[in-house]
Interface confidence: low
C-alpha cells in the first residue's frame, strides 16, 4: 500500500522536511503532489512525467519544493503556513490512479524567556508574589525551577495561566531562592535567567551575647546584639529604660555595682517597619576580700588534741568551702564543720592530718581561695627499731647499733645494757667485744614535746660457737604448680656462711631454686610433689658450724586422674561387681560414684551384688581435694551379659 512518511513530523520554522514515499508501484506514467487531503488542481504543488523526466510546477508551488525520481518531496525553509496535509497522486502506465496522504506540523523556534514579577520586595508572612514567564507563546509548555530543582509540593505555591504564572502566597524568608522559567515546544526548549526573590523579614527577637549575666566590679562589659533581618537591622541600646547608643555592640569599661540593671537591645527593620526587643539583667558584684585561715592550736598532739580551723573574715550570706590536699573534704567522723561551714574541726588529730588546708569564699562569680595552711602535728615516738638485725656476734669484732623511732619533733635517744644507762646518743658503739658484752640492749626514744617515751630491747649474744639454726617458712602447705615457698635460716648472724641440703644432698641445679639474702633464704618456685623432701640449713664461721633439724615440705597436690580397678568391662549376670577407685592426691581425696549420671555413694569402693543386664552403663568415679580445690574424674563402661551368652568374668 502506498504510504507517506514525514521526516521529521514536527518541523522547526526555517528548517526542511522530507515527505518520503513508501511502496511506490511499478510501471508508472507519472505523479503529482497536492497541498491538502485531496487532489485539487488549484492546490497542485508539482507534477512529474517519468517518460520525459519533466517536472511541472502547479499553482501551489512556492519555489521551496524539490521532487525526486522516487516521488519523495523535499520542502525547504519551512514556514508556519506549511503545516498540514500533503497528497501524492500516482498515475500508472495503465492509467489506473493511486493516492496517499501525509502530514507534518510546523513550530516556531522559541525565544529565550524572561521572568516578570508583580512585587520586587515582598514582606514575609504578608505579601504574595506572582512570577510570569514572558513572552506568551502559542503551543508552548511552561515549566518552573527553584534553585535548579523542580517545584516543591506546597499549598503556598500555585500555577495558573497555563502554568505561565507562578504565585507564592504568604512568602517566607525561606522563599529567598533562585527562580527560573522554561518554555518548551516539540522543536525547542529555552530557560530564562535566574531571578532572586528578595523577601523582607524580621527583625526576629534579638539575642544578646555573651549569655552570662554576672560580672565582677572592675571588669569590662561588652554586649553584642544580633537579630535575623532583611535588610539588616538597626540596633539601639537602653539601660534601665534610658537610651544609650545606636550601635550593635555596647561597651562599658571598668564597671561597678552601679552598672547593675536591665539592658535592652532594640532591633529595627526600616523596610518592614518592625521593632523587636530583648532584655537581659546584668548583676555586678563587688570583689570579696581574700580569705585566710586561723587555728586554735598550732602544735596539736596526735591522738590527744583537736584543732579548730576558721576561715576569715566572717561575711554574712556567704558560702564557705574547704579543701584538704587539694581535694574536697573526705567523709570522716573526725572531721566536723560548723553550721555555717566557716569552722573545720579535726577531732583527735593524727600525723596524717598535716594538710595542706585551704578555705574558700564562694560568691556569685567564683571561689576565692586562702593560702594553704599546714598543721604541725606532734606525734611519737613510735616503737624504735634497732639495726642491724644481727643477734650473734663473734668475740673481737666491733658492735655498732643504731636506733630510730618516728617522732615529731625528732626523738632523743638513750641506750641501756642490762638495765644500766650507757649514753644519750642515737648510735651505740663498742669496739673489740667479748662474751661479757652479751646481754639485753635497750634503746629508749623520748619526745620532749609530748613527753612520751618508747623502748625496744634486743638480746645480743657474743660467742665463738654458733647456735643451732632453725628453718622458718612463709608457706607451710604450698599447692603444686601454683605456690612458691621461701625457707629462711634463722638467726641472722654476722660474718656467717649459710648452707642448704635437700634429703642430705647439696642443692641440685634447678631454675626453680633460688638463693638470696646472702644464701640465708632458699626459694622454691612453682613447687611440685617431688619437692616434698627434708630440707636442712647450716651456718658456719671460722670457728664453728651447726645444722638445723630437717623440715619436710608438705606439698598439696592432685587429685590426679583416677584409676578404676579391676580393668574388666564385661561381666556375667549374677556376678558381684566390686570396683575400686584410686587417685594420687595430698591430702587423700574424697571419692564419689555415679552410675549413668545418677549419684551413688561417697566411698572409694563401689560394690553391687549379683549384677544383671540392668546394671549395664557408665560408671564414673569423682575425686576432689578440698585443700587444693581441684577435682578430677574417670568414666568406665560396664557390660553385663546374660549367663552363657558371652565369656564373662566374675568378680
Amino acid at each position: 500500500k502506498l504510504t507517506i512518511e514525514s521526516t521529521p513530523f514536527n518541523v522547526a520554522e526555517g528548517k526542511e522536511v522530507l515527505l518520503l514515499v513508501h511502496n511506490l508501484p511499478q510501471h508508472l506514467f507519472g505523479y503529482s503532489w497536492y497541498k491538502g487531503e485531496r487532489v485539487d488542481g488549484n492546490r497542485q504543488i508539482i507534477g512529474y512525467v517519468i517518460g520525459t523526466q519533466q517536472a511541472t510546477p502547479g499553482p501551489a508551488y512556492s519555489g521551496r519544493e524539490i521532487i525526486y525520481p522516487n516521488a519523495s518531496l523535499l520542502i525547504q525553509n519551512i514556514i508556519q503556513n506549511d503545516t498540514g496535509f500533503y497528497t501524492l497522486h500516482v498515475i500508472k502506465s495503465d492509467l489506473v490512479n493511486e493516492e496517499a496522504t501525509g502530514q507534518f506540523r510546523v513550530y516556531p523556534e522559541l525565544p529565550k524567556p524572561s521572568i516578570s514579577s508583580n512585587n520586587s520586595k515582598p514582606v514575609e508572612d504578608k505579601d504574595a508574589v506572582a512570577f510570569t514567564c514572558e513572552p506568551e507563546t502559542q503551543d508552548a509548555t511552561y515549566l518552573w525551577w527553584v534553585n535548579n530543582q523542580s517545584l516543591p509540593v506546597s499549598p503556598r505555591l500555585q500555577l495558573s495561566n497555563g502554568n505561565r504564572t507562578l504565585t507564592l502566597f504568604n512568602v517566607t524568608r525561606n522563599d529567598t531562592a533562585s527562580y527560573k522559567c522554561e518554555t518548551q515546544n516539540p522543536v525547542s526548549a529555552r530557560r530564562s535567567d535566574s531571578v532572586i526573590l528578595n523577601v523582607l523579614y524580621g527583625p526576629d527577637a534579638p539575642t544578646i551575647s555573651p549569655l552570662n549575666t554576672s560580672y565582677r566590679s572592675g571588669e569590662n562589659l561588652n554586649l553584642s546584639c544580633h537579630a535575623a533581618s532583611n535588610p539588616p537591622a538597626q540596633y539601639s541600646w537602653f539601660v534601665n529604660g534610658t537610651f544609650q547608643q545606636s550601635t550593635q555592640e555596647l561597651f562599658i569599661p571598668n564597671i561597678t555595682v552601679n552598672n547593675s540593671g536591665s539592658y535592652t537591645c532594640q532591633a529595627h527593620n526600616s523596610d518592614t517597619g518592625l521593632n523587636r526587643t530583648t532584655v537581659t539583667t546584668i548583676t555586678v558584684y563587688a570583689e570579696p576580700p581574700k580569705p585566710f585561715i586561723t587555728s586554735n592550736n598550732s602544735n596539736p598532739v596526735e591522738d590527744e588534741d583537736a584543732v579548730a580551723l576558721t576561715c576569715e573574715p566572717e561575711i554574712q550570706n556567704t558560702t564557705y568551702l574547704w579543701w584538704v590536699n587539694n581535694q574536697s573534704l573526705p567523709v570522716s567522723p573526725r572531721l566536723q564543720l560548723s553550721n555555717d561551714n566557716r569552722t573545720l574541726t579535726l577531732l583527735s588529730v593524727t600525723r596524717n592530718d598535716v594538710g595542706p588546708y585551704e578555705c574558700g569564699i564562694q560568691n556569685e562569680l567564683s571561689v576565692d581561695h586562702s593560702d594553704p595552711v599546714i598543721l604541725n602535728v606532734l606525734y611519737g615516738p613510735d616503737d624504735p627499731t634497732i639495726s642491724p638485725s644481727y643477734t650473734y656476734y663473734r668475740p673481737g669484732v666491733n658492735l655498732s647499733l643504731s636506733c630510730h623511732a618516728a617522732s615529731n619533733p625528732p626523738a632523743q635517744y638513750s641506750w641501756l645494757i642490762d638495765g644500766n644507762i650507757q649514753q644519750h646518743t642515737q648510735e651505740l658503739f663498742i669496739s673489740n667485744i667479748t662474751e661479757k658484752n652479751s646481754g639485753l640492749y635497750t634503746c629508749q626514744a623520748n619526745n620532749s614535746a609530748s613527753g612520751h617515751s618508747r623502748t625496744t630491747v634486743k638480746t645480743i649474744t657474743v660467742s665463738a660457737e654458733l647456735p643451732k639454726p632453725s628453718i622458718s617458712s612463709n608457706n607451710s602447705k604450698p599447692v603444686e604448680d601454683k605456690d612458691a615457698v621461701a625457707f629462711t635460716c634463722e638467726p641472722e648472724a654476722q660474718n656467717t656462711t649459710y648452707l642448704w641440703w635437700v634429703n642430705g644432698q647439696s642443692l641440685p641445679v634447678s631454675p626453680r631454686l633460688q638463693l638470696s639474702n646472702g644464701n640465708r633464704t632458699l626459694t622454691l618456685f612453682n613447687v611440685t610433689r617431688n619437692d616434698a623432701r627434708a630440707y636442712v640449713c647450716g651456718i658456719q664461721n671460722s670457728v664453728s658450724a651447726n645444722r638445723s633439724d630437717p623440715v619436710t615440705l608438705d606439698v598439696l597436690y592432685g587429685p590426679d586422674t583416677p584409676i578404676i580397678s579391676p580393668p574388666d568391662s564385661s561381666y556375667l549376670s549374677g556376678a558381684n561387681l566390686n570396683l575400686s577407685c584410686h587417685s594420687a592426691s595430698n591430702p587423700s581425696p574424697q571419692y564419689s560414684w555415679r552410675i549413668n549420671g545418677i549419684p551413688q555413694q561417697h566411698t572409694q569402693v563401689l560394690f553391687i551384688a549379683k549384677i544383671t543386664p540392668n546394671n549395664n552403663g557408665t560408671y564414673a568415679c569423682f575425686v576432689s581435694n578440698l585443700a587444693t580445690g581441684r577435682n578430677n574424674s574417670i568414666v568406665k563402661s560396664i557390660t553385663v551379659s546374660a549367663s552363657g551368652t558371652s565369656p564373662g568374668l566374675s568378680a
Partner: nanobody, 117 residues
Framework: QVQLVESGGGLVQPGGSLRLSCAAS????????MSWVRQAPGKGLEWVSG????????RYADSVKGRFTISRDNAKNTLYLQMNSLKSEDTALYYC??????????WGQGTLVTVSS
C-alpha cells in the same frame, strides 16, 4: 584595654591531645582568678576549669576531670589548658576568661577544637 588571645586549637582524632594557650594583657593577670569555658555547636556556655592566682589550686568540671589540666605562668601572663584523651563531645569553641564559677569577666575570641575521626 583587656585583651585575651587564645591559640592551640585544631582538628584532632579521638584519644588525641592538644594544648591551648591564652595570652593576657591590659590587666593584672597575676591577681586574677582565671577560667576556661567552652561552647559546643548549638549549645550554651559550659565552664571547664578554673585556677587561683598563684596556681596552687585548680578545679575541673566532672566531664573533663582526669583528662584536662589547667596551669598558668604569671611571669609570661599566660594561661594553659592541656587536653588529653579527647572525645568527640569535647568539640567546641574554647574561651579563656577572667573569673570563674558562675560568671566570667572579659574573654577572648576563642579557639576552635574539633575532635573527629
Amino acid at each position: 584595654q583587656v585583651q585575651l588571645v587564645e591559640s592551640g586549637g585544631g582538628l584532632v582524632q579521638p584519644g588525641g591531645s592538644l594544648r591551648l594557650s591564652c595570652a593576657a594583657s591590659g590587666f593584672t593577670f597575676s591577681s586574677s582568678y582565671m577560667s576556661w569555658v567552652r561552647q559546643a555547636p548549638g549549645k550554651g556556655l559550659e565552664w571547664v576549669s578554673g585556677i587561683n592566682t598563684d596556681g596552687s589550686f585548680t578545679r575541673y568540671a566532672d566531664s573533663v576531670k582526669g583528662r584536662f589540666t589547667i596551669s598558668r605562668d604569671n611571669a609570661k601572663n599566660t594561661l594553659y589548658l592541656q587536653m588529653n584523651s579527647l572525645k568527640s563531645e569535647d568539640t567546641a569553641l574554647y574561651y579563656c576568661a577572667v573569673g570563674g564559677g558562675l560568671g566570667y569577666g572579659p574573654w577572648g575570641q576563642g579557639t576552635l577544637v574539633t575532635v573527629s575521626s
